[in-house]
Amino acid sequence: KAMHVAQPAVVLANSRGTASFVCEYASPGKATEVRVTVLRQADSQVTEVCAATYMMGNELTFLDDSICTGTSSGNQVNLTIQGLRAMDTGLYICKVELMYPPPYYMGIGNGTQIYVIDPEPCPDSD
């Protein structure tokens, strides 16, 4: 593979449908601008969940309507995906691109299997 990207094999979303995992990459050099993309792979279909470009040392900025948030520390990105439901269970791949300075490097992780269990509805109480 290209650049090494590591991520946990399995994560369980909490009862509020939030899952967090760390995406760590081995940078060949001193990148100042990094792009992180989360991809969901299901039935050989790959869709982009969210993406953020950040300057090293700064916060990740996802689009306002994104279901992802994140923080960065060195070559680690802490990603949180919110609003997940059981149907969103699947393999979430972390893709990292070193955008600046050139040369361009990219890599993808092996994916994190996120399991989401919908909470049981509260029983009616009289």
């Epitope: 290209a2 940078s27 060949p28 991809l39 790959v46 040369p103 361009y104 490097y105 990219m106 993808i108």
Partner: antibody, heavy 115, light 107 residues
């Protein structure tokens, strides 16, 4: 200004050896993976070999067509990457480019294999 | 190994036209695709990196798109200076295979 300057090409007989060098300036050599890519009329562009840098333990990778015959190496103190080519064949003929990542390319050096 | 299939192998177009070159990968390369321009007698030059990003110093008339296994390079408002051979390359995993090239000529 980024410069990659390849030297060492020329005419060589089949079965013989040749060593190419590439001196780099204008970007941080030690921060980058270096490659050799060759160009021939028959095959177009063909990646030949890659050497990664210290964070990647100077790992080396080769195309199947040169594995066991070619050796890529680097000297970070001289900002130079080398390609040792042994047991050369007619199909190894072409212009050999040294590249930084795949962003920066040298001007190329011509390798001719002929009896 | 990932195979890259480029088409067409050659094309001829008039100045001012828009042309599209396509590149297919034998498996998903997750946007790990570069495009290069090689003019006669010159070294290849990086044109597009990461499928969609324009390399420094290259004209904005060039644009890249695609994902998964299918990618394309669009050249808008063709200039005589665009005469060259264009190559795609897989940059996801070794071996870093190139497409066969597309030779662009001006009518």
């Amino acid at each position: 200004e980024v410069k990659l300057d390849e030297t060492g090409g020329g005419l060589v007989q089949p079965g013989r050896s040749m060593k190419l060098s590439c001196v780099v300036s204008g970007f941080t050599f030690s921060d980058n993976w270096m490659n050799w890519v060759r160009q021939s009329p028959e095959k177009g562009l063909e990646w030949v070999a890659q050497i990664r840098n210290k964070p990647y333990n100077f790992e080396t990778y080769y195309s199947d067509s040169v594995k066991g015959r070619f050796t890529i190496s680097r000297d970070d103190s001289k900002s130079t990457v080398y390609l040792q080519m042994n047991n050369l064949r007619a199909e190894d003929m072409g212009v050999y480019y040294c590249t930084g990542g795949f962003t920066y390319w040298g001007q190329g050096t011509l390798v001719t294999v002929s009896a | 190994d990932i195979q890259m299939t480029q088409s067409p192998a050659s094309l001829s177009a008039s100045v001012g036209e828009t042309v599209t070159i396509t590149c297919g990968a034998s498996e998903n390369i997750y946007g790990g695709l570069n495009w290069y321009q090689r003019k006669q007698g010159k070294s290849p030059q990086l044109l597009i990196y990461g499928a969609t990003n324009l390399a420094e110093g290259m004209s904005s008339r060039f644009s890249g798109s695609g994902s998964g296994r299918q990618y394309s390079l669009k050249i808008s408002s063709l200039h005589p200076d665009d005469v060259a051979t264009y190559y795609c390359q897989n940059v996801l995993s070794s071996p870093w295979t190139f497409g066969g090239g597309t030779k662009l000529e001006i009518k």
